[in-house]
Each structure stands twice: as structure tokens, then as C-alpha cells.
């Protein structure tokens, strides 16, 4: 069976890494486990990994935004940032604003790798399932 | 044969959903049908679906922009928004501006699903084939 | 073996097209050659091609930004722009700013095609491996 995941935004995320909806809606989870915000790889190989985050706010103050997909493995002491997007000076001060960050690329992942998504400012994330998501599939 | 599509912008179109060039240029269409702006799935399975839209204007007024990929199937009464990007407060008032929205993710699609792209303001879309496109492939 | 590449930013790029790190870090290169900034296809077929570029500057002057993935083949006299992103009027004058451009789509590539990435303003690109990259894989 194809190893694939597509998880969508979960609005009761209160901490980092982001947590995801893994059951309802347009979610996919097959041959990959979901655990505490992370996608857990159980077969070494090449994977296309992607994430989109939708940031928005009522009154722009140009708080720097970052969106990272990173990997953690008990064999390594430190998280590895696989992909990252940053935004600074992206809206007009005081205005209602909205912006997305999209990341996607191919990586060689190892069994037991845990993949997560991090953002710099949780309060500015909108978690609609069509707007904020995290996924992968094995090539 | 691999089920795949890559359709490019069609500039003389005034209708929603967006219409696409399905014949000339860097277009691909194999094992998937194109009908009135939509990609029609004829085999159930996992697909990576993507779209990019290039918005631009002569004089910025920060008109809210949205870019959606949605699905329609005669079995369901309502369109399902699969992916969406929104932009607000994205340029400096009065200036010439340009911005892209990119969407891409994996979905479980069913035979007879029709996939479309919608934007909030057609007048602000530039339809160059390298800038505005819509595609998918079966995993 | 799966034909795949994921190359990351190389900060000593001084000319166009962009040059890439093809050896160290989270780089992948299998069944595809890397030559002077280009990915060289050695087997005709369908490929998903992607690139992200991270632009940033100390003081915004809204210099127009472009990010292109293009193809060159000795059989054709001219480069073919496969995907392109443009940005104009994207930050507040005088402020420190940062923005990414992401491109990704499916193409039918031919043996001996050379794929490259071009940007309009090299001095505004940040080459961190997680932020600026170029890749592909054969479907």
C-alpha cells in the first residue's frame, strides 16, 4: 500500500510543534503513523514532503513569520530543518492581512524519523483544512 | 500509462471556474479528461494536485485575492474546497504589483470527480503559461 | 533506481543561472547529473520539478523579483521558461524584508534536457539549504 499522509489544521493547537487533524475531513494517513504533531516514518526511502500554513491577522504589525518543516530522530541530538519559509515586512501597518507559506521537496527519510511543522507565531495561524496542511508520500 | 495533467493559463477566458489551455505549449494531458475548465478523474486513487496563479495589477488597492482548487461530484450537493490561498494587504497602495499563489497536496480522488480552479478576481490574473497553471498526477 | 535530485543553495553563486550544492547536507542526486548549475536529464519521461528561492534585504526598495525554472536543449535555439514567479510591490520602503517564491509542476522531459534556475537579483537571495533549493523526481 502507498505510504501517504495529508493532515489538516487543528485549531486547538496550543503549542509547538503544530498538531494536526488525522481523522476527519480530507485527511489521509496510510503506511505512516501520526504521533503528537509528528509524522513517523516506518520505511526508509525517498519521500516528497509538503506543508502550507495560512497566516492572517486583524491589524498588521509585520511580526516576522516563519514556517518550518523539521525532522527529529533519536539517533541525532538536534532537529534538522528540512524546509523553511520566512516573511518580514509583508503587509501595511494597521490593516487586516492574510498570507500563505508553501513548502515542498524530496528527502531521503529513515525509518523512525519524526517530521514536524513549526511556526513562529501560533496566534496568527488559521487552521481551516483547505488552508493549513502537512503531508508526504513515498516516491 | 501514467495519469497526468499540466494545463496552462488561457487568457481570453472570462468564466469561473478558470478555463485552461489543454492543447498547445507545455501542456500535458494523459489518462485524464479536460472538460469546461475541469480535470475529470476516470480512475479512483491517490493524486498529487497542484496549481499556481499569478496575480498582478497596474495600481494596488489591496483587493482581497483568493485562489481555490475545488472538487465537484454529482453524488455530492456541494463543492469541496481542497486547497485555498488568500491574500490581503499585500502591496503598497497605488503601485504596480505582482504576486503568486501556489497550492499542492495529495488527495484520494474518485472516478468522475471534477477538479476546478477558482479565483476571486479574474481581471487580476495573468495567464502566461509559465506563471498560471493547474495539474495533477496519479501516485 | 529512482531518478531524483534535491540541490540546495550555494552562497558563492556569482552568476546566472544559480549554482547549487550537490554534495553536502540534505542533498540528493541519483540518476540525474549536475553540471554548471543545471540538472541534466538522461532518461526521457515525466518529472515533477520544483524550486524555492528565499529573497531578503536590509532595506526594502521593492526591486522587482523574478524566479524562473527554465530548460535548455542543444536541439532548440532558445531557453524554454517552464515555471516562473514574479513579485512587485511586496514590502514597505526602507524596512528589512523577506519573502519566498515556490514553483512546482509536472513536465515531459527529454534525455539531454538541462534544467536551470534564474533569479532577477542575485544579491537578494539567501542560500540557506532549507530556504533555497531546486529538485525533481521522475514519476
Amino acid at each position: 500500500l502507498r505510504k501517504v499522509a495529508h493532515l489538516t489544521g487543528k485549531s486547538n493547537s496550543r503549542s509547538m510543534p503544530l498538531e494536526w487533524e488525522d481523522t476527519y475531513g480530507i485527511v489521509l494517513l496510510s503506511g505512516v503513523k501520526y504521533k503528537k504533531g509528528g509524522l513517523v516514518i516506518n520505511e526508509t526511502g525517498l519521500y516528497f514532503v509538503y506543508s502550507k500554513v495560512y497566516f492572517r491577522g486583524q491589524s498588521c504589525n509585520n511580526l516576522p513569520l516563519s514556517h518550518k518543516v523539521y525532522m527529529r530522530n533519536s539517533k541525532y541530538p538536534q532537529d534538522l530543518v528540512m524546509m523553511e519559509g520566512k516573511m518580514m515586512s509583508y503587509c501595511t501597518t494597521g490593516q487586516m492581512w492574510a498570507r500563505s507559506s508553501y513548502l515542498g521537496a524530496v528527502f531521503n527519510l529513515t525509518s523512525a524519523d519524526h517530521l514536524y511543522v513549526n511556526v513562529s507565531e501560533l496566534s496568527l495561524v488559521n487552521f481551516e483544512e483547505s488552508q493549513t496542511f502537512f503531508g508526504l508520500y513515498k516516491l | 500509462l501514467r495519469k497526468v495533467a499540466h494545463l496552462t493559463g488561457k487568457s481570453n477566458s472570462r468564466s469561473m471556474p478558470l478555463e485552461w489551455e489543454d492543447t498547445y505549449g507545455i501542456v500535458l494531458l494523459s489518462g485524464v479528461k479536460y472538460k469546461k475548465g475541469g480535470l475529470v478523474i476516470n480512475e479512483t486513487g491517490l493524486y498529487f494536485v497542484y496549481s499556481k496563479v499569478y496575480f498582478r495589477g497596474q495600481s494596488c488597492n489591496n483587493l482581497p485575492l483568493s485562489h481555490k482548487v475545488y472538487m465537484r461530484n454529482s453524488k455530492y450537493p456541494q463543492d469541496l474546497v481542497m486547497m485555498e490561498g488568500k491574500m490581503m494587504s499585500y502591496c503598497t497602495t497605488g503601485q504596480m504589483w505582482a504576486r503568486s499563489s501556489y497550492l499542492g497536496a495529495v488527495f484520494n480522488l474518485t472516478s468522475a470527480d471534477h477538479l476546478y480552479v477558482n479565483v476571486s478576481e479574474l481581471s487580476l490574473v495573468n495567464f502566461e503559461e509559465s506563471q498560471t497553471f493547474f495539474g495533477l498526477y496519479k501516485l | 533506481l529512482r531518478k531524483v535530485a534535491h540541490l540546495t543553495g550555494k552562497s558563492n553563486s556569482r552568476s546566472m543561472p544559480l549554482e547549487w550544492e550537490d554534495t553536502y547536507g540534505i542533498v540528493l542526486l541519483s540518476g540525474v547529473k549536475y553540471k554548471k548549475g543545471g540538472l541534466v536529464i538522461n532518461e526521457t519521461g515525466l518529472y515533477f520539478v520544483y524550486s524555492k528561492v528565499y529573497f531578503r534585504g536590509q532595506s526594502c526598495n521593492n526591486l522587482p523579483l523574478s524566479h524562473k525554472v527554465y530548460m535548455r536543449n542543444s536541439k532548440y535555439p532558445q531557453d524554454l521558461v517552464m515555471m516562473e514567479g514574479k513579485m512587485m510591490s511586496y514590502c514597505t520602503t526602507g524596512q528589512m524584508w523577506a519573502r519566498s517564491s515556490y514553483l512546482g509542476a509536472v513536465f515531459n522531459l527529454t534525455s539531454a534536457d538541462h534544467l536551470y534556475v534564474n533569479v532577477s537579483e542575485l544579491s537578494l537571495v539567501n542560500f540557506e539549504e532549507s530556504q533555497t533549493f531546486f529538485g525533481l523526481y521522475k514519476l
Partner: antibody
Framework: QVQLVQSGAEVKKPGSSVKVSCKAS????????ISWVRQAPGQGLEWMGW????????QYNENFKGRATLTTDKSTSTAYMELSSLRSEDTAVYFC????????????WGQGTLVTVSS | EIVMTQSPATLSVSPGERATLSCRAS??????????IHWYQQKPGQAPRLLIY???HLESGIPARFSGSGSGTEFTLTISSLQSEDFAVYYC?????????FGQGTKVEIK
């Protein structure tokens, strides 16, 4: 900058036709609708219809169907509104306006053309 | 067709005061994304000028004292502190469906 320049005032007899022109500049003519709106003396605004210069498609207000004809000339970036079978109640200022396709707001207007229908 | 009703027909306000103009649609002009209502200002002998689009968005070049609000069928244009150049007729227009229709206008005059 965006400009819409209309033809001059007209005086017409009842039963005749009038053709008002609207020359656009400062933007890509084929990417926006041109709408026509009229205003009778001392009255409000009444939308007549739109035309999309990109493919020539058009839509009319039912009140003007069969009497109004909207056309464009892409080579000169000019839109035209012809109104036939004129009657005295057609006396009005006729405006052309650039209209965004989806949002359908009128963001730039011509200066207006006064058409007087009188015997 | 959707009928747009504006009130009051005439509003007498002193310079520097706040003006609140209402517009009611005979059916909803809102979707999940936007409210398709736009406001225009017209002075004698001139073409209308777009002020507010999609209910609450200020058009480029329009002073920030103009603001719009509302959704569904009830909409408001507010001028926070009237200047001499603001005395004019104001129209709302919907673009939810065909035909596009305008309200009959509200004349803002000097008190």
C-alpha cells in the same frame, strides 16, 4: 494611469439611434469588462450591461435587451454603446466604466455623455 | 432582481461631524468569502467615484475617514469627520448577481 474618454454630447430625434464611444488607455483593455451606466436628469444610476473585450461576450439588463448593443474595437481600445428606438425618457448622461470581472465594481469612469432625445 | 434601498434620502450634517449612511439589499449579497457591495460618491456634473468595495475595503486614494461595514443585507458607509469636499450624493451598488443595481442615493448636505 487609467483613463476612459467618451464622445461628445448628442441630440437625437425620437425613434432614431445613438452610438456613444469610450476610449480606454492606461491598462490592458482585454482584461476588464466595460460596463455602461446611465443617469436621467436628477435621478439615480441605472446599469445597462457589460461587455468583455477579451472575447466580445456581453450581458444586458433586461430593461435594455433588444435596444442596446455593446461592442468593442480591440485595435483602438474603444468600447461602444448603441441605443436604438430612442424615446424622450432615454434622455440621460451615459457613462462607461471599467469593471472588474469577478468583483464587478466600477473602479474607473468616463466623464459621461449627455444624450438628449427631443422632437 | 435585488433591490437596494438607501436611507435616509437626505442627511444634513455639520462639517466635522460623523455621517452614517445605510443601504439594505432585498436579499443577501454576501458569500462565505465576500460581501458584494460597493459605495460611490458623486458630485454635481461629475462621474461617480468608487470609495469602498466589497463592503469594507477602502479604494486606493480615498481618505481613511471613509469606512464601510456590514454583511448579508445590511450595510453602512461611515464618514468619521465630514470635510467640505464630502458633501455629495452617495450610492451603494451590489454585484452579487445580474442585473447590477444601485440604491437611489443618499444626499449628504451641509446643516
Amino acid at each position: 494611469q487609467v483613463q476612459l474618454v467618451q464622445s461628445g454630447a448628442e441630440v437625437k430625434k425620437p425613434g432614431s439611434s445613438v452610438k456613444v464611444s469610450c476610449k480606454a488607455s492606461g491598462y490592458t483593455f482585454t482584461r476588464f469588462d466595460i460596463s455602461w451606466v446611465r443617469q436621467a436628469p436628477g435621478q439615480g444610476l441605472e446599469w445597462m450591461g457589460w461587455i468583455f473585450p477579451g472575447d466580445g461576450s456581453s450581458q444586458y439588463n433586461e430593461n435594455f435587451k433588444g435596444r442596446a448593443t455593446l461592442t468593442t474595437d480591440k485595435s483602438t481600445s474603444t468600447a461602444y454603446m448603441e441605443l436604438s428606438s430612442l424615446r424622450s425618457e432615454d434622455t440621460a448622461v451615459y457613462f462607461c466604466a471599467r469593471s472588474l470581472i469577478s468583483t464587478a465594481m466600477f473602479d474607473h469612469w468616463g466623464q459621461g455623455t449627455l444624450v438628449t432625445v427631443s422632437s | 432582481e435585488i433591490v437596494m434601498t438607501q436611507s435616509p434620502a437626505t442627511l444634513s450634517v455639520s462639517p466635522g461631524e460623523r455621517a452614517t449612511l445605510s443601504c439594505r439589499a432585498s436579499k443577501s449579497v454576501s458569500t462565505s468569502d465576500f460581501s458584494y457591495i460597493h459605495w460611490y460618491q458623486q458630485k454635481p456634473g461629475q462621474a461617480p467615484r468608487l470609495l469602498i468595495y466589497l463592503a469594507s475595503h477602502l479604494e486606493s486614494g480615498i481618505p481613511a475617514r471613509f469606512s464601510g461595514s456590514g454583511s448579508g443585507t445590511e450595510f453602512t458607509l461611515t464618514i468619521s469627520s465630514l470635510q467640505s469636499e464630502d458633501f455629495a450624493v452617495y450610492y451603494c451598488q451590489h454585484s452579487r448577481e445580474l442585473p447590477r443595481t444601485f440604491g437611489q442615493g443618499t444626499k449628504v448636505e451641509i446643516k
